[in-house]
């Protein structure tokens, strides 16, 4: 692969991690002790876009598997999934726009803010269990903040 | 303003291991999202990779040079060192140590250098 | 494996635009950078990303890269322009790769 990657897990402001949900799904809940071992593994490439000081424009692959989180029009809603992609051809520099999050780093906390759909970020519920999902608002209900743990290879 | 400070012996003899250390100021050599590098120039020459580490323990090396180089970190100091084992005079150079941020595919703070000689 | 080849010398008048290339198999495909190295020092990141320039670097570097080919230019160019210039990129089998140097000279 052309790109530089990096492993990683993340968890959201609450300490909830992420699980899969069926093949296409993320879900995120609170996992302790052996737990951990369910949670998804990212493989966070840094790929071209708009990069200010503090946006770095990333892709969100699952580890060894060739699914990445997209952003889509659902029913005229920006709608968070996992997209399957040919891993002969992926990750690549110049990544399609659906597959690209800008990493927004404020007080060593972390946002995935959709390039596709400006304003639109990774989000989870309060509640334990739920969908992780593409949220357009920011400081309500819903968790925009994540935090990222390094993973060796 | 990160800083970064090359050490070593500025004499090796031939065979035996070269051994620089980095010391990093301004920044923390364990802080996720970058890899700490070493290259060097022999005289009148190019840029030639040696090879990096990043997280406190993964690294990429130079196929050729893969069999000599041994990278590491001393969190504790905020430090990395370079050894390059049975050196020749064709390893006599200055070398450098840098900064590359994984987003950049670039190395922003190198630096100053030292000059190593291979010698009898 | 992966290799980077540039021109060993560029010559260009005060004023005038310069133009370095870079050229690797599909280096489009890959990212590129571009350093700046005055005698006795050490080199300087001017372009990184293929495009993008560090804080400090003036507009009149700028980058392209696509194809086989990334090119450096320098437009307006100074007698402080006159130096050595390396293109790098990153490559996963080989890692990270530089070009051999061109030695930009200002008439």
């Known amino acids: 692969a052309p790109v530089r990657s990096l492993n990683c897990t993340l968890r959201d402001s609450q300490q909830k991690s992420l699980v899969m949900s069926g093949p296409y799904e993320l879900k995120a809940l609170h996992l302790q002790g052996q737990d951990m071992e369910q949670q998804v593994v990212f493989s966070m490439s840094f790929v071209q876009g708009e990069e200010s000081n503090d946006k770095i424009p990333v892709a969100l692959g699952l580890k060894e598997k060739n699914l990445y989180l997209s952003c889509v029009l659902k029913d005229d809603k920006p709608t968070l999934q996992l997209e399957s992609v040919d891993p002969k051809n992926y990750p690549k520099k110049k990544m399609e726009k659906r597959f690209v999050f800008n990493k927004i780093e404020i007080n060593n906390k972390l946002e995935f803010e959709s390039a596709q759909f400006p304003n639109w970020y990774i989000s989870t519920s309060q509640a334990e269990n739920m969908p992780v999902f593409l949220g357009g608002t920011k400081g309500g209900q819903d968790i925009t903040d994540f935090t990222m743990q390094f993973v060796s290879s | 303003q990160v800083q970064l400070q090359e050490s070593g012996p500025g004499l090796v003899k031939p065979s035996e291991t070269l051994s620089l250390t980095c010391t990093v100021s301004?920044?923390?050599?364990?802080?996720?999202?970058?890899?700490w590098s070493w290259v060097r120039q022999p005289p009148g020459k190019g840029l030639e990779w040696i090879g990096c580490?990043?997280?406190?323990?993964?690294?990429n090396y130079n196929p050729s040079l893969k069999s000599r180089v041994t990278i590491s970190v001393d969190t504790s100091k905020n430090q990395f060192s370079l050894k390059l084992s049975s050196v020749t005079a064709a390893d006599t150079a200055v070398y450098y140590c840098?900064?590359?941020?994984?987003?950049?595919?670039?190395?922003?703070?190198w630096g100053q250098g030292t000059t190593v000689t291979v010698s009898s | 494996s992966f290799e980077l080849t540039q021109p060993p010398s560029v010559s260009v008048s005060p004023g005038q635009t310069a133009s370095i290339t870079c050229s690797g198999d599909?280096?489009?495909?890959?990212?590129a950078c571009w350093y700046q190295q005055k005698p006795g020092q050490s080199p300087v990141l001017v372009i990184y990303?293929?495009?993008k320039r560090p804080s400090g670097i003036p507009e009149r570097i700028s980058g392209s890269n696509s194809g086989n080919t990334a090119t450096l230019t320098i437009s307006g160019t100074q007698a402080m322009d006159e130096a050595d210039y390396y293109c790098?990129?990153?490559?996963?089998?080989?890692?990270?790769?530089f070009g051999g140097g061109t030695k930009l000279t200002v008439l």
């Open positions: 790098q990129a990153w490559d996963s089998s080989t890692y990270v790769v």
């Open positions: 599909k280096l489009g495909d890959k990212f």
């Open positions: 990303q293929d495009t």
């Open positions: 840098a900064r590359d941020p994984m987003h950049y595919y670039g190395m922003d703070v």
């Open positions: 301004g920044g923390s050599v364990s802080s996720g999202g970058y890899y």
């Open positions: 580490i990043y997280f406190s323990e993964s690294t």
